[in-house]
Amino acid sequence: TIDTKRNISAEEGGSVILQCHFSSDTAEVTQVDWKQQDQLLAIYSVDLGWHVASVFSDRVVPGPSLGLTFQSLTMNDTGEYFCTYHTYPGGIYKGRIFLKVQESSDDRNGLAQFQTAPLG
C-alpha cells in the first residue's frame, strides 16, 4: 500500500518535500515515477538511480529517500502530484498529493500594509 499526506501546503518561493511511503511484505520497489499533474517530474530506478526531467532540473532535488524536494515554488505549482511505485512482483501502486502554494507571509503582510496605508 501507499501512505502519503493527501493535502499539504507551502509558501510561494519556498520549498516542499513530496513523499510517498510504500509498504509490502513481499514486493520490492523497482522504480518510482513522480508527476505534476500529467507532467513527468523525476524517476528513480533501482538500476539507474535518479533522473530529474530537464524541465524541472533547476527546481527539483531527489530525496529524501524516494521522495522529492520541490524548490522555488510558484502559485502555478498548486495542484495534484502523483507517485507511481513499480514493484516486483506486486505490480503498480499509486499515491496522490494535493499541494496548495500560498502567498508568502511577507507578501501577505506587505499587501496588508499597502491596503491600510493612508491615501496621499
Epitope: 522504480q31 508527476k35 500529467d38 507532467q39 513527468l40 524517476i43 530506478s45 538500476d47 539507474l48 533522473h51 526531467a53 524541465v55 516486483y88
Partner: antibody, heavy 118, light 107 residues
Framework: EVQLLESGGGLVQPGGSLRLSCAAS????????MNWVRQAPGKGLEWVAY????????GYADSVKGRFTISRDNSKNTLYLQMNSLRAEDTAVYYC???????????WGQGTLVTVSS | DIQMTQSPSSLSASVGDRVTITCRAS??????LNWYQQKPGKAPKLLIY???SLQSGVPSRFSGSGSGTDFTLTISSLQPEDFATYYC?????????FGGGTKVEIK
C-alpha cells in the same frame, strides 16, 4: 561515450533464420532495458521488441511474436535478436536502442540491413 | 494498440522559419511522448522526452509541449541542419508506437 554496434544482417531466403547482435560499450549495459526497432526501406520506424535489464521481462510487436526472440548476455554487453520464419515484409534496417527507465530511447546504433528475398 | 498520428506528413520551410509539428495519440498517454530526428542513412536521434524535456546536447530552439492526446514539437528558428524527418513515439504502453513521420524540406 555510449556506443551500440549492430551486426548479423544480410540476405536470407523467406522462411530462413538470422541472428542479430548489438555490442554495447561506454555504459553499464546490465542496468538498462534494451530495444530493437526496425525501418523498412523508405518507411517509418516500427518497434520490434524490448528486454528489461535482468532479462525477466520481454515484449514483442504482434508482427513478430512467435517468430523473433530477444535476449541479452550482460557478461558480454551484448543484445541479440533471433529471427526465425523470416518473411519479405521483415526486410528492414534493424536498430538496437537503449531505453532508460523504459520511457524513451536515448541512444541508437547505426543499424544493420536485413533483406528477405528469394 | 495506441495509434500515433503525425501532421503534416511533410512541409517546406526556409531557414529562420518557426516550424510546428503535431502528434495525436488515439488515447491518453499522459506525458509519455518522445520526439526523434532522423537524417537520411542515419539512426534516429532523441530530441525531446516526456513531452517537454530537452535531451542533453539538443539545441534550445527545439521544444515540446502537450499532454494527454495532443502534442507539439516546435523549432523556433529553423537551421540548415534541421532539415530531416521527425517522429513522435509513445511510451505509455507496449507495443511502443511511432507516428508516421514529418519530413521537413527546404523551400
Amino acid at each position: 561515450e555510449v556506443q551500440l554496434l549492430e551486426s548479423g544482417g544480410g540476405l536470407v531466403q523467406p522462411g530462413g533464420s538470422l541472428r542479430l547482435s548489438c555490442a554495447a560499450s561506454g555504459f553499464t549495459f546490465s542496468s538498462y532495458s534494451m530495444n530493437w526497432v526496425r525501418q523498412a526501406p523508405g518507411k517509418g520506424l516500427e518497434w520490434v521488441a524490448y528486454i528489461k535489464s535482468n532479462s525477466g521481462t520481454k515484449g514483442y510487436a504482434d508482427s513478430v511474436k512467435g517468430r523473433f526472440t530477444i535476449s541479452r548476455d550482460n557478461s558480454k554487453n551484448t543484445l541479440y535478436l533471433q529471427m526465425n520464419s523470416l518473411r519479405a515484409e521483415d526486410t528492414a534496417v534493424y536498430y538496437c536502442a537503449r531505453g532508460p527507465y523504459d520511457y524513451w530511447l536515448d541512444y541508437w546504433g547505426q543499424g544493420t540491413l536485413v533483406t528477405v528475398s528469394s | 494498440d495506441i495509434q500515433m498520428t503525425q501532421s503534416p506528413s511533410s512541409l517546406s520551410a526556409s531557414v529562420g522559419d518557426r516550424v510546428t509539428i503535431t502528434c495525436r495519440a488515439s488515447q491518453s498517454i499522459s506525458s509519455y511522448l518522445n520526439w526523434y530526428q532522423q537524417k537520411p542513412g542515419k539512426a534516429p536521434k532523441l530530441l525531446i522526452y516526456a513531452a517537454s524535456s530537452l535531451q542533453s546536447g539538443v539545441p534550445s530552439r527545439f521544444s515540446g509541449s502537450g499532454s494527454g492526446t495532443d502534442f507539439t514539437l516546435t523549432i523556433s528558428s529553423l537551421q540548415p541542419e534541421d532539415f530531416a524527418t521527425y517522429y513522435c513515439q509513445q511510451s505509455y504502453s507496449t507495443p511502443l508506437t511511432f507516428g508516421g513521420g514529418t519530413k521537413v524540406e527546404i523551400k
